[in-house]
């Protein structure tokens, strides 16, 4: 029951994940990992924040949004087919069994090559259309699995299906949002 997102080879993929700090600067550690969320922590960590900053990241993985405001959405640069799979966003709220974890499924499709006149074929093949926006199209599924019920968070899932890939910036609204405090 993971939320599913799609991107084409060569695009930047965008995996939304949000929380609302109780007050400005009241940040919560977050980890992103490749693979479904385990019982604790993240497996195969690709990026991690602490209460102040991004303290670990790997090549091609970065936070494009303002993580100090709770936007911890992950951008993966220039994706390949090997980037397909489940990613875990874990909001590490201090306390026993207090973490919020979200599994997001990334599906990478081969790049579309637009048919072109014969004389342009070589040019088109060498330079396929690439999107440089931070988003990459609509979420295919908007159903979140059961979420931990914890004392200090109020959980809501925002937005419905996005139908237009031009609404890249609106992808943020399809992420899971939790309020801390």
């Amino acid at each position: 029951s993971e939320v599913e997102y799609r991107a084409e080879v060569g695009q930047n993929a965008y995996l939304p994940c949000f929380y609302t700090p109780a007050a400005p600067g009241n940040l919560v550690p977050v980890c992103w990992g490749k693979g479904a969320c385990p019982v604790f922590e993240c497996a195969n960590v690709v990026l991690r924040t602490d209460e102040r900053d991004v303290n670990y990241w790997t090549s091609r993985y970065w936070l494009n949004g303002d993580f100090r405001k709770g936007d911890v959405s992950l951008t993966i640069e220039n994706v390949t087919l090997a980037d397909s799979g489940i990613y875990c966003c874990r909001i590490q709220i201090p306390g026993i069994m207090n973490d919020e974890k979200f599994n997001l499924k990334l599906v990478i499709k081969p790049a579309k090559v637009t048919p072109a006149p014969t004389r342009q074929r070589d040019f088109t093949a060498a330079f396929p259309r690439m999107l440089t926006t931070r988003g990459h199209g609509p979420a295919e599924t908007q159903t979140l699995g059961s979420l931990p019920d914890i004392n200090l968070t109020q959980i809501s899932t925002l937005a419905n299906e996005l139908r237009d890939s031009r609404l890249a910036n609106d992808l943020r609204d399809s992420g899971a949002t939790i309020r801390i405090g």
């Epitope: 700090p21 109780a22 007050a23 600067g25 009241n26 940040l27 919560v28 550690p29 019982v39 604790f40 922590e41 209460e51 590490q92 201090p94 306390g95 026993i96 069994m97 207090n98 059961s146 979420l147 931990p148 019920d149 914890i150 004392n151 200090l152």
Partner: antibody
């Protein structure tokens, strides 16, 4: 007052199964996360398993993953620990414990001894 | 997971004297946003379950005598029994509830000298 009454311990052979129960009174079980903590003879405390108030989320220590299942019946105010594929190293006193506000263990059951031996 | 290490393993103190138990965590259990240390202390007497003594590092549980006090921050914590009584003979455990699985120290046995 809050009470946690445990039952279900005993002697079992390696590979066997046991089900522990923890009957809660003095509070509404569904309002609190709960845990099982064990203590091997002469040793310290080890967290084993935990469950959210609704029962929708469960957590297990690596040492028991795939073998132990925590569950709860909120209508009966009872917590359970199903233990399968038991090993000698699972021999311990098992305590159920109420978690206060996702933080510390504020009430504990009296404990029940599980002995795994052939 | 966070590893909790207590010292000493055992302690013999004369009645009426001060007993001090130390607890060290492998990483900070201080959450800077609320300035709280996610650390508790428990007392376990022979044949009994553990009993919560102190939480949030220094807050005594209801009914716990004021001779018990907790202090520290970050990774280093202390439980102090200001004037040891016979009924204080027990094993004492620290526990972090900051992140991952909740973990306990190995315990410190307090005896009468």
């Amino acid at each position: 007052q809050v009470q946690l009454q445990q039952s279900g311990g005993g002697l079992v052979q390696p590979g066997g199964s046991l089900r522990l129960s923890c009957a809660a009174s003095g509070f509404t079980l569904s309002s609190y996360a709960m845990s099982w903590v064990r203590q091997a003879p002469g040793k310290g405390l080890e967290w084993v398993s935990g469950i959210s108030g609704s029962g929708g989320s469960t957590y297990n220590a690596d040492s028991v993953k795939g073998r132990f299942t925590i569950s709860r019946d909120n209508s009966k105010n009872t917590l359970f620990l199903q233990m399968n594929s038991l090993r000698a190293e699972d021999t311990a006193v098992y305590y159920c414990a109420k978690i206060f506000g996702s933080y510390y263990f504020d009430y504990w059951g009296q404990g029940t001894l599980v002995t795994v031996s052939s | 997971e966070i590893v909790m290490t207590q010292s000493p393993d055992s302690l013999a103190v004369s009645l009426g004297e001060r007993a001090t138990i130390n607890c060290k965590s492998s990483q900070s259990v201080l959450y800077s946003s609320n300035n709280k240390n996610y650390l508790a202390w428990y007392q376990q007497k022979p044949g009994q379950p553990p009993k919560l003594l102190i939480y949030w590092t220094s807050t005594r549980e209801s009914g716990v005598p004021n001779r018990f006090s907790g202090s520290g921050s970050g990774t280093d914590f202390t439980l102090t029994i200001s004037s040891l009584q016979a009924e204080d003979v027990a094993v004492y455990y620290c526990q972090q509830y900051y992140s991952g699985p909740p973990t306990f120290g190995q315990g410190t046995k307090v005896e009468i000298k």
